[in-house]
Each structure stands twice: as C-alpha cells, then as structure tokens.
Interface confidence: low
C-alpha cells in the first residue's frame, strides 16, 4: 500500500546545500541532489542543494547546459558533495543524458 510507512524512504537523499537558498543550513533532504553554475551579471554563481519534488528535478536535470547555466544532478546521500557543474566549452556539446548521474 502506497501510504505504508517505509523503514527507509528510498527516494529521499541527504544533499550538500550551498548558496543563498540554504539560509544557515549546510544540508537538505530531497529526491535528487544537484550542483549548479550560472552566470549572473558576469559573476559565476555556484549552488548546491536538493529537489524535494522529483518532477521539479526531472525537468531541471534534463536541461542541457547552456552558455549561461549548467546543472548536474545525482541520487545518493551526499552525492553532490564533489560535483562541480561546468559550463560547456566552445565547440563542445553535452547531451542532457550525460548530465544525470545515478549512484
């Protein structure tokens, strides 16, 4: 039965959280972890965190990197700890499927 309490919820992972949206916390719990890089007014903005709703992560994680933004997603406790998103270099393309890591 879907509502029965699982002993361990297999879809929730502990993620490293870094960036403005994290407030004072350095971790969060969600269905996917991510590491992102975006260019904002010429500055590189790195963020890490979690998607608490799977659909939200699915949409974002499947987006191929653009010159202004890249997101790498993974599933596994602290899996985003050592992931640093990178913007595509000139002349290289990164298919969206390469942008999703399952641990």
């Amino acid at each position: 039965m879907e509502d029965e309490k699982p002993k361990v919820n297999p879809k929730l992972y502990m993620c490293v959280c870094e960036g403005l949206s994290c407030g004072n916390e350095d971790h969060c719990e969600g269905q996917q972890c991510f590491s992102s890089l975006s260019i904002n007014d010429g500055f590189h903005v790195y963020q890490k965190g979690c998607f608490q709703v799977y659909e939200q992560g699915k949409m974002t994680c499947k987006t191929p990197p653009s010159p202004g933004q890249a997101v790498e997603c993974c599933q596994g406790d602290w899996c985003n700890r050592n992931i640093t998103a990178q913007l595509p270099t000139k002349g290289k393309s990164f298919p969206g499927t390469q942008n999703f890591h399952l641990e």
């Epitope: 309490k5 002993k7 361990v8 719990e29 969600g30 269905q31 608490q52």
Partner: antibody
C-alpha cells in the same frame, strides 16, 4: 531550507485540551513525515505521533486515544491535539520533519499544566 | 522497542575520548540515529544509520555497532560538546529514544 514555526497555548488547566500548530516553510509536504515530540523538564524525548501529506497518522500507543494529529496541506500546516491533560503532560513540545531521522525541528513550545 | 542508553551522565576532561552506548531491546536493522541537544535548544541530528555523519558535523564524532548494540564516540572532547546526547531507532513504530547521556567537562 525547510523551516518549522510552531505556536499554541502555553498554560493549561487539568482536563483541558492542548492544541499546537506547526507551519512549514520551504518544504514539500510529500517529502517528509511530520511528527510531534515532547520533552518534560529535565527529562528525555518522547515521540507522540506522525502524519504524512495524505493525512495518514501513526500515534504512540502510550498516549492511547488522547492524541490527534491533523494536516492542512493548503496552509502547509500540521497540528497536535492532546485531550484531558494532566500535570504529567507538562513539557516542551516540538514539531519535526523527518524521514530516516528528525532532520528539522520547530523552536519548541513550553506547555505547563497547572490548576 | 526499548532503547537503553548508558551512562546517564559522565564527566570528562577536554581532549578525552568519550563513548556512549545504546542497546536496543531487539534487532533494529541498523536504523539508528544520534542527536545532540544543547541547553535551551532543540535536538540536532548528528549521525544517521549508525555511522553516517551529517555535513558540518566534526569528524571527532563517530558511531558504530550493529544488531542491538551501538556506540557513539567523541574522540577528543571539546568545550562546545557539552550537551545531552540521545540515540533513536526507526525500525518500527513507535519511534523511541534512549534516555539520554549528559556530557560535562571535568574541572
């Protein structure tokens, strides 16, 4: 980040009903179980019960049928009702968000039951 | 499931190795967490699933054990570690905590 803010009456008389509410900010209701935990002065922690986003509850049998936990997903809130309180129910009450562990906690509400 | 924690209190010097034990009344399949609670604050999850530290938790904290017997260790006690520590299982309902261990600095 998930933040929990709780409120409710802090002073009750014996036989009255304790009512506390916890508001959830920046959190997905479907991602967590929502629990109430209490701690009598100078004592340990006691889990009272939990609810999920669908309203399914599990309560601690030690409190029999005195505990009711409810959820209002439209307001991102969940609540605790404890009926027929006695001095033994004097404690700090915490709301929490958990899956494998109680990861996020409210600030706590000190409830005193005294005639 | 009952969780028996010992000792209920201890006093140690800064730099000492401190160990707290937690015994479950039955096998809890390693579904065991450890919390730190400082005076006037809500508890804080330090370790989940026996030995996994949350990020930001100093590496001097560690957990071990399996089945019914578990331990929590502070390898080198620091003044900021003064708190009460609780174990908690989530193998079955109701979820229960150990009675707590209050750690103080010996002067």
């Amino acid at each position: 980040q998930v933040q929990l803010q709780q409120w409710g009456a802090g002073l009750l008389k014996p036989s009255e009903t304790l009512s506390l509410t916890c508001a959830v900010y920046n959190g997905s209701f479907s991602s967590f179980y929502w629990s109430w935990i209490r701690q009598p002065p100078g004592k340990g922690l006691e889990w009272l019960g939990e609810i999920n986003h669908r309203g399914r509850t599990n309560n601690n049998p030690s409190l029999a049928s005195r505990v009711t936990i409810s959820v209002d997903t439209s307001k991102s809130q969940f609540s605790l009702r404890l009926t027929s309180v006695t001095a033994a129910d004097t404690a700090t009450y915490y709301c929490t968000a958990h899956t494998r562990g109680f990861l996020y906690w409210g600030q706590g509400t000190r409830v005193t039951v005294s005639s | 499931i009952q969780m028996t924690q010992s000792p209920s209190s201890l006093s140690a010097s800064v730099g000492d190795r401190v160990t707290i034990t937690c015994q479950a009344s039955q096998d809890i399949n390693n579904y065991l967490n450890w919390y730190q609670q400082k005076p006037g604050q809500a508890p804080n999850l330090l370790i989940y699933d026996v030995f996994n530290l949350l990020p930001g938790v100093p590496s001097r904290f560690s957990g071990s054990g399996s089945g019914t017997d578990f331990s929590f260790t502070i390898s080198s006690l620091q003044p900021e570690d003064i708190a009460t520590y609780y174990c908690q299982h989530y193998d079955d309902l109701p979820l229960t905590f150990g009675g707590g261990t209050t750690v103080a600095i010996r002067r």
